[in-house]
């Protein structure tokens, strides 16, 4: 069988949801010594980067200026060390936002609920769309989808204090073109009667995977380059 290098890791810097006309930055983390990185969009070659010097850096950044719906979609990357190519990275969905209009978001029974109650978010957008998305801030990978002509429901619960946080919704014109975000709705979940509102909540971690962790090589890193890839893939 043909030998390949471990697959790289593709990430969006800061966020995979990019407002239209803004710049998107994608990182491809491969291996020290890689001489070429290729970014593929919807299966076709989109851009090429050659790190300088290749043996000193374990990845590259691809800058995508002037984001629009034609550049939104599925990206992947590969890299080359000498004549040997890597496996293809996982796919990354890059979304363009701030298209057209702004939806409104409401929550039932209200923004302050008690643990155990069921909650429904309603997202409304009058312009033609069929898919709606609900995201919790700090958990932007956990997208809930719902369908409707001008509005959609997102039932939740019974809620716990882990549901606390700020929520926004989007209307979607296709999988990769989203509206402006709604104004946030902050959900406050108080504990059971016995626990009161001081019940602890799960911390809302930022989207820590949406950062580019490209590192310059040290002597030790050079020896452990392949181990690094294995560990990164395990972490993912």
């Amino acid at each position: 069988p043909k030998q390949t290098l471990p697959k790289p890791i593709i990430r969006a810097e800061s966020t995979y949801m990019v407002p239209k006309e803004k710049q998107a930055t994608l990182c491809c983390q491969g291996s020290y010594g890689a001489v070429e990185y290729q970014l593929h969009f919807e299966g076709s070659l989109f851009a090429v980067e050659r790190p300088k010097p290749p043996e000193r850096i374990n990845g590259v950044k691809f800058h995508i200026p002037d984001m629009n719906s034609r550049k939104a979609g599925r990206y992947s990357c590969i890299y080359r060390v000498g004549e040997l190519w890597s496996e293809r990275s996982d796919l990354l969905d890059l979304v363009v936002t701030e298209m057209y209009d702004t939806p409104t978001l409401s929550v039932h029974p209200g923004p302050e609920v008690t643990s155990g109650e069921k909650v429904t978010f309603y997202c409304r957008l009058d312009t033609a769309t069929s898919m709606f998305l609900l995201l919790k801030e700090g958990r932007s990978r956990d997208v809930q989808r719902s369908y409707g002509k001008v509005q959609a429901e997102f039932p939740m619960g019974p809620v716990t204090t882990a549901h606390r946080g700020s929520y926004r919704c989007f209307g979607s014109y296709n999988n990769y073109a989203w509206s402006f975000p709604s104004e946030p709705v902050k959900l406050l979940v108080t504990g059971d009667i016995e626990n009161t509102s001081l019940a602890p909540t799960d911390p809302t971690f930022p989207d820590s995977w949406d950062t580019c962790l490209l590192t310059r090589e040290t002597g030790l890193q050079k020896d452990l380059a392949l181990w690094d890839h294995t560990a990164q893939n395990l972490l993912r």
Partner: antibody, heavy 115, light 107 residues
Framework: QVQLQQPGSVLVRPGASVKLSCKAS????????MHWAKQRPGQGLEWIGH????????NYNEKFKGKATLTVDTSSSTAYVDLSSLTSEDSAVYYC????????WGAGTTVTVSS | DIQMTQSPSSLSASLGERVSLTCRAS??????LNWLQQEPDGTIKRLIY???RLDSGVPKRFSGSRSGSDYSLTISSLESEDFVDYYC?????????FGGGTKLEIK
Amino acid sequence: QVQLQQPGSVLVRPGASVKLSCKASGYTFTSSWMHWAKQRPGQGLEWIGHIHPNSGISNYNEKFKGKATLTVDTSSSTAYVDLSSLTSEDSAVYYCSRGGRFDDWGAGTTVTVSS
Amino acid sequence: DIQMTQSPSSLSASLGERVSLTCRASQDIGSSLNWLQQEPDGTIKRLIYATSRLDSGVPKRFSGSRSGSDYSLTISSLESEDFVDYYCLQYASSPWTFGGGTKLEIK
């Protein structure tokens, strides 16, 4: 304190439409859901639908789609239910109720459909 | 739609007696349940929300509880003004639905 003022009664002809009002005071009108419910004489309560004055989001009981239309006028803090093509089956007391958990209730409007 | 089966539909009891009314939910509603009181003139007042939380101004003789899909309203010691109609209401899943009601009569 919260008050939801509804007209006491209204008499309408079969086939006609009627718009019932619910004037809210004592709270921020745009921040709470407004529900409407129906109660036929000697019967239980049925939920018609609700509307959020801030977002305009509304949701209906399937049974009342085409029969009831919910609207709000935020400038006067008033919610409305429009009932169309009235028949004797629509003779009932109609209540408005504030808040997602039906916190407060109006006194109800008695609608009598009769020729 | 979620069905709320309320029992009994009517109940005769004496002053000072302890009574319980029950609503059974056909699907999971979590703690999203109210108990409402309706007077003969039609006035509706919420007594309990979120299964067991007492509204302000409601006497402590009223309490709410849950066991699985069964939700109960208990009046610990009946007073004359308690002999009216009671409804449960689930607000977990649209369309929100009411129980059929319980008429509490004085024995």
